[in-house]
């Protein structure tokens, strides 16, 4: 199936109730087959995808989704108005920003229209299911001869996020990690001018506004050092894994080249 289904680390407040036909204990029929679990993720509080593994059904089935908010002004049952499909059958529902209420208990119900009593209800705390967009606009500043400061931006959710910075040099086999609170800056106090550094950042909706377990994607990496740091030692910004190599580096030809080409250029 083409639908991407993220698996959460678990939402401890999620509960599932199955309303099923009663059957003799020695006979498990299709009508009692549990429905797939619904996984919901709120992307940057812009929209929410609630998806399920449609191929776990015994045959292709257009399951239907309803939702409401428990004990709130929004407790009216709503039908999904924008289904997601895999292999021509429903495999998810997308809710828009205006339908998302982070701090009310979200109730989602999946149902088999061919077996109306075959339905499952889950309760979710949406503030624990937010996944922010990857950090953007990474920039590096040299604060002193040996100190670098990394800055970045997040779209809309700034104070609600914590961050994880990873960095390494070309000589390192693994990343060094550093947690950063809601401020989006990180200082590296001791930089070796002879090495080339790579930095990347990811963010999480935790702990000020929610308790999400899922990190954003990693930002595009940003690099510092090697030949380029000598050209402009006080400010060096790089985005989207591309780098401008100077004329002298390329024998008088200025050119935008990829990260792969860059590695080749520096090591040969």
């Amino acid at each position: 199936l083409n639908t991407t289904i993220l698996t959460p680390n678990g939402n401890e407040d999620a509960t599932t109730d199955f309303f099923l036909t009663s059957m003799p204990t020695d006979s498990l029929s299709v009508s009692t087959l549990p429905l797939p679990e619904v996984q919901c993720f709120v992307f940057n509080v812009e929209y929410m995808n609630c998806t399920w593994n449609s191929s776990s059904e015994p045959q292709p089935t257009n399951l239907t989704l309803h939702y409401w908010y428990k004990n709130s002004d929004n407790d009216k049952v709503q039908k999904c108005s924008h289904y997601l499909f895999s292999e021509e059958i429903t495999s998810g529902c997308q809710l828009q920003k205006k339908e998302i209420h982070l701090y009310q208990t979200f109730v989602v119900q999946l149902q088999d229209p061919r077996e109306p009593r075959r339905q499952a209800t889950q309760m979710l705390k949406l503030q624990n299911l937010v996944i922010p967009w990857a950090p953007e606009n990474l920039t590096l500043r040299k604060l002193s001869e040996s100190q670098l400061e990394l800055n970045w931006n997040n779209r809309f959710l700034n104070h609600c996020l914590e961050h994880l910075v990873q960095y390494r040099t070309d000589w390192d086999h693994s990343w060094t990690e550093q947690s950063v609170d809601y401020r989006h800056k990180f200082s590296l106090p001791s930089v070796d001018g002879q090495k080339r550094y790579t930095f990347r950042v990811r963010s999480r909706f935790n702990p000020l506004c929610g308790s999400a377990q899922h990190w954003s994607e990693w930002s595009h990496p940003i690099h510092w050092g090697s030949n380029s740091s000598k050209e402009n030692p006080f400010l060096f910004a790089l985005e989207a894994e591309q780098k401008l190599i100077s004329e002298e580096d390329l024998g008088g030809e200025q050119k935008l080249i990829s990260e792969e080409d860059l590695h080749h250029h520096h090591h040969h």
């Epitope: 498990l28 299709v30 087959l33 549990p34 191929s55 015994p58 292709p60 292999e87």
Partner: antibody, heavy 119, light 108 residues
Framework: QVQLVQSGAEVKKPGASVKVSCKAS????????MHWVRQAPGQGLEWMGW????????NYAKRFQGRVTMTRDTSITTAYMELIRLRSDDTAVYYC????????????WGRGTLVTVSS | EIVLTQSPGTLSLSPGERATLSCRAS???????LAWYQQKPGQAPRLLIY???SRATGIPDRFSGSGSGTDFTLTISRLEPEDFAVYYC?????????FGQGTKVEIK
């Protein structure tokens, strides 16, 4: 490697019952529906039903309901198909077939078990 | 239930020739849910095509599937000696799963 190994050929008398086994290996047994399909000599393929090893749920083709029982033993990753009140027209090769995890076609078949019903 | 009718019953061809097998459904089958299998004597069926046109892993590209709605086709562009066998179509979009009665491709 990924395979389904079925039990050996059986000869039964009319009215008797037969239980065919299908041992799965090389993949997560509980993650795939297991279907049973039969083929009478010189004939086409006939679907009999499925079992979901994860939960034990089953679904049988109408013509076999009341005569067929599909079970599984997850501890030995084996599925079983039992057919009772055998008749001569139940003489066939019985296949277990794994349903794909991504869709609903059969992507892996056992080699088949010949069941002969004769007085 | 959906009845699948295959034609012709037997196809007599020589190696190197093109084989065209037809499968017609009694009611519309979503193209996502039609498969073709090959079966040789004494062997289990083997998946060739799923979703009407997607080749299964390890299946040579001389095998291709097409069609939608009620009419589906399996084409073998150039028959190899090992392709002489019986071919079955199957719909898996609704229960009960059903198969066509098969087309035998034999050496002329």
């Amino acid at each position: 490697q990924v395979q389904l190994v079925q039990s050996g050929a059986e000869v039964k008398k009319p009215g008797a019952s037969v239980k065919v086994s299908c041992k799965a290996s090389g993949y997560t047994f509980t993650g795939h529906y297991m279907h049973w399909v039969r083929q009478a000599p010189g004939q086409g393929l006939e679907w009999m039903g499925w079992i979901y090893p994860h939960s034990g749920h089953t679904n049988y083709a109408k013509r076999f309901q009341g005569r067929v029982t599909m079970t599984r033993d997850t501890s030995i990753t084996t599925a079983y198909m039992e057919l009772i009140r055998l008749r001569s027209d139940d003489t066939a090769v019985y296949y277990c077939a794994r349903r794909s995890g991504r869709s609903w076609y059969f992507d892996l078949w056992g080699r088949g078990t010949l069941v002969t019903v004769s007085s | 239930e959906i009845v699948l009718t295959q034609s012709p019953g037997t196809l007599s061809l020589s190696p190197g020739e093109r084989a065209t097998l037809s499968c017609r459904a009694s009611q519309s089958v979503s193209s996502s849910y039609l498969a073709w299998y090959q079966q040789k004597p004494g062997q289990a069926p083997r998946l060739l095509i799923y979703g009407a046109s997607s080749r299964a892993t390890g299946i040579p590209d001389r095998f291709s599937g097409s069609g939608s709605g009620t009419d589906f086709t399996l084409t073998i562009s150039r028959l190899e000696p090992e392709d002489f066998a019986v071919y079955y179509c199957q719909q898996y979009g609704s229960s009960p799963w059903t198969f066509g009665q098969g087309t035998k491709v034999e050496i002329k």
